[in-house]
């Protein structure tokens, strides 16, 4: 640790006086202290004298030695009083900038340690501190303000009794600086923007922060626009507005817009784009496929997205048919808005019946014209069976027909025994029939195919079965030939409940 | 080894505030005084400001209406904001520590601000 | 208008020694240090001399510096090629209550 001569913590002189203050450590050494006037510096290795011929009150401060090489940083610190009768108080600064919750320390120093008692602290004026102003004081540093707030900024002076009169100092200003937590907020509105060339534009570019010293502007494709700026200051917060009003749009005015602020924290930026048109448009478009199909009792939405500019002056969905002319119920359709100029459509329906297959249109206007969108929606059912014996030419002919959607498969199998249905261990003979006859297949509708298995002989203690199975399930009807004639058997649970 | 560091922007329009930080790397803002100097062909090296005791501060009377100086001790960082500048602030700005005897031992490399629209 | 007086220019030619000087007044160097500055073109300035003729470490001891009452001098013995720079005086000034500067001496040499 450096050592100072003289080996005092305090020295108290004379204005006018000499003053010599040497340091000495085992490497080199450097003063530190308030900057003022009058002294000069001499060093010659390990020791480094401070000294000033001519003594004046603005001497009065602390004076630290410090070893720079000391791994350690150990330092000496020597306290020195230039006691002038006419200026009890020697002020560092002209103003003290710290922010909000900080300690502030105003910098005046009592050039004569015998008036500390006396010492307090106003407002220039004579005005009284404020309420709530917490603060202490020492005579070698000055008067310090705990947990300084913004309103406390104001100019200060300090005062101290001598001869039973105060004596203020000159004034020290007090500027309490908000905590700025980052870059200013930004808005930048639209967040899109449509026009046809010849409209009116209006693109407002705004930032706040809680302190004042921050910059905005608004550039477009990188180039900076002069706009004036208005600025304001509510909720606590300094804002400042750029509006760009722009009567008639051209191409040239296209393009990408971005909202810039900055202040010492850093920077914010966000961008819009600005598109211009020649006429009015509206598309429309759906992710989902145009051909549906969905099993009869389960629920579908059936979704559009529209871009348009200028916006929808109407839309619906409606049912083309071909079943009922129901319409679909208002309430299954909502439409969301995604932003300005895209919207998304939906039609909810739920527990589809037989009679709402079919089409559906949604149809959207604007100052573009109509556009129209149709979904085509088809019901997948499981299939239903029926087995009939009849002749056919003279031949004993069992006769499935079989309905549902997608087109059922047909297989016949035969099984010893009476049975509602074949089980594995007793069937005796399966047969495919890879081309049953489609007997109708109309759009939106099942489709009924029929197959034909020629039996020359009715065996009486077995049982022909015809099954149909499709995507959806399958079906079966089971035919028991009997002395009396035949007797078919349709299966034990009823398949399909719409 | 000491080193001070300008950064800010290059332009400023007039009626603005100009504001640059210098960043000290090598040593503590907390210790000796830290000075704002300015330099232009019109008038030659000029004394901006000081701040001290990270918040104490003092300005050439010439300029004081205009400008405050602060610290940042959390960064090691000092700033300057000049507000209403004009084409006479045009100048090359450096930061400087002062020590005591009042001389400027290190130096940033300077930045060049213009005032101009 | 700078507020210590300097020739506005100096030159001299290598090994040669030369001398410039710097004027004030009572409020300045008549009651305060002087300090020097070596500007190199393009660059910042760089501390020369401190408390009148104190020299920081790396300075050659070619260069010196002196005060009596209100006036300073630095002088550079021995010239060298890479001395030619623009050279500043500079003192705390008692009635600004801050630094101030000399306008400048631009050395040439020769």
């Known amino acids: 640790i450096p050592v100072i001569e003289p080996s005092v913590p305090e020295l108290v002189v004379k204005p006018g006086a000499t003053v010599t203050l040497r340091c000495v450590g085992n490497g080199s050494v450097e003063w530190d202290g308030p900057p003022s006037p009058h002294w000069t510096l001499y060093s010659d290795g390990s020791s480094s004298i401070l000294s000033t011929n001519n003594a004046t009150f603005q001497n009065t401060g602390t004076y630290r030695c410090t070893e720079p090489g000391d791994p350690l940083g150990g330092s000496a610190a020597i306290h020195l009083y230039v006691k002038d009768p006419a200026r009890p108080w020697n002020v560092l600064a002209q103003e003290v900038v710290v922010f909000e919750d900080q300690d502030a320390l105003l910098p005046c120093l009592l050039t004569d340690p015998v008036l500390e008692a006396g010492v307090s602290l106003v407002r220039v004026r004579g005005r009284p501190l404020m309420r709530h102003t917490n603060y202490s004081f020492s005579p070698w540093h000055g008067f310090t303000i705990h947990r300084a707030k913004f309103i406390q900024s104001q100019d200060y002076q300090c005062s101290a009794l001598m001869g039973g009169r105060k004596v203020m100092s000159i004034s020290i200003r007090l500027k309490v600086q908000k905590v700025i937590p980052g870059p200013p907020a930004l808005t930048l509105v639209p967040a899109e923007l449509v026009r046809i060339r010849g409209e009116a534009a209006q693109i407002v570019c705004s930032a706040s922060s809680v302190d004042v010293n921050f910059d905005v502007f608004l550039q477009h494709n990188n180039t900076k626009l002069a706009i004036p700026q208005q600025s304001d200051f509510h909720n606590n917060r300094y804002q400042k507005v750029l509006t760009l009003n722009l009567d008639q749009v051209d191409f040239q005015h296209a393009g990408n817009y971005s909202c810039v602020a900055s202040n010492v924290q850093g920077k914010h930026s966000t961008s819009m784009f600005f598109r211009v048109v020649e006429s009015a448009y509206l598309n429309l478009s759906s992710e989902q496929n145009l051909i549906q199909e969905v099993t009869v009792g389960e629920g579908l939405n059936l979704k559009v997205m529209v871009e348009a500019y200028p916006g929808l002056q109407g839309f619906n969905w409606t049912y083309l048919g071909p079943f009922s002319d129901h319409q679909p119920e208002p309430k299954l359709a909502n439409a969301t808005t995604k932003d300005t100029y895209r919207h998304t459509f939906t039609l909810s329906l739920p527990r589809l019946k037989p009679s709402e297959a079919g089409r559906y249109s949604f149809l959207a206007r604007n100052p573009g014209g109509w556009r129209a969108l149709t979904f085509e929606l088809t019901l997948r059912y499981p299939p239903e069976v029926s087995v009939i014996w009849t002749f056919i030419n003279g031949s004993g002919t069992l006769l499935c027909a079989a309905s549902g959607y997608p087109q059922p498969n047909v297989t016949w199998l035969q099984c010893s025994g009476h049975t509602d249905r074949c089980d594995e261990a007793q069937v005796l003979q399966v047969w495919d029939d890879p081309y049953p006859e489609v007997l109708s297949q109309e759009p939106f509708h099942k489709v009924t195919v029929q197959s034909l298995l020629t039996v020359e002989t009715l065996e009486h203690n077995q049982t022909y079965e015809c099954r149909a199975h499709n995507s959806v399930g399958s079906g079966s009807w089971a035919f028991i030939p009997i002395s009396a004639g035949a007797h078919t058997h349709p299966p034990d649970e009823f398949l399909f409940t719409p | 080894q000491v080193q001070l560091q300008e950064s800010g922007p290059g332009l400023v329009k007039p009626s603005e505030t100009l504001s640059l930080t210098c960043t000290v790397s090598g040593g503590s803002i907390s210790s000796f005084y830290w000075s704002w100097i300015r330099q232009s062909p019109g008038r030659g090296l000029e004394w901006i400001g000081y701040?001290?005791?990270?918040?104490?501060?003092k300005y050439n009377p010439s300029l004081m209406s205009r400008v405050t100086i602060s610290a940042d001790t959390s960064k090691n960082q000092f700033s300057l904001k000049l507000s209403s500048v004009t084409a006479a602030d045009t100048a090359v700005y450096y930061c400087?520590?002062?020590?005591?005897?009042?001389?400027?031992?290190?130096w940033g490399q300077g930045t060049l601000v213009t005032v101009s629209s | 208008q700078s507020v210590l007086t300097q020739p506005p220019s100096a030159s001299g030619t290598p090994g040669q020694r030369v001398t410039i000087s710097c004027s004030g007044s009572s409020s300045n160097i008549g009651n305060n240090a002087v300090n020097w500055y070596q500007q190199l073109p393009g660059t910042a300035p760089k501390l020369l001399i401190y408390s009148n003729n104190q020299r920081p470490s790396g300075v050659p001891d070619r260069f010196s510096g002196s005060k009596s009452g209100t006036s300073a001098s630095l002088a550079i013995s021995g010239l060298q090629s890479e001395d030619e720079a623009d050279y500043y005086c500079?003192?705390?000034?008692?009635?600004?209550?801050?630094?101030?500067f000399g306008g400048g001496t631009k050395l040439t040499v020769l």
């Open positions: 701040i001290f005791y990270s918040g104490s501060t």
């Open positions: 400087a520590r002062g020590r005591l005897g009042n001389y400027f031992d290190y």
């Open positions: 500079a003192a705390w000034d008692d009635s600004l209550n801050g630094p101030v």
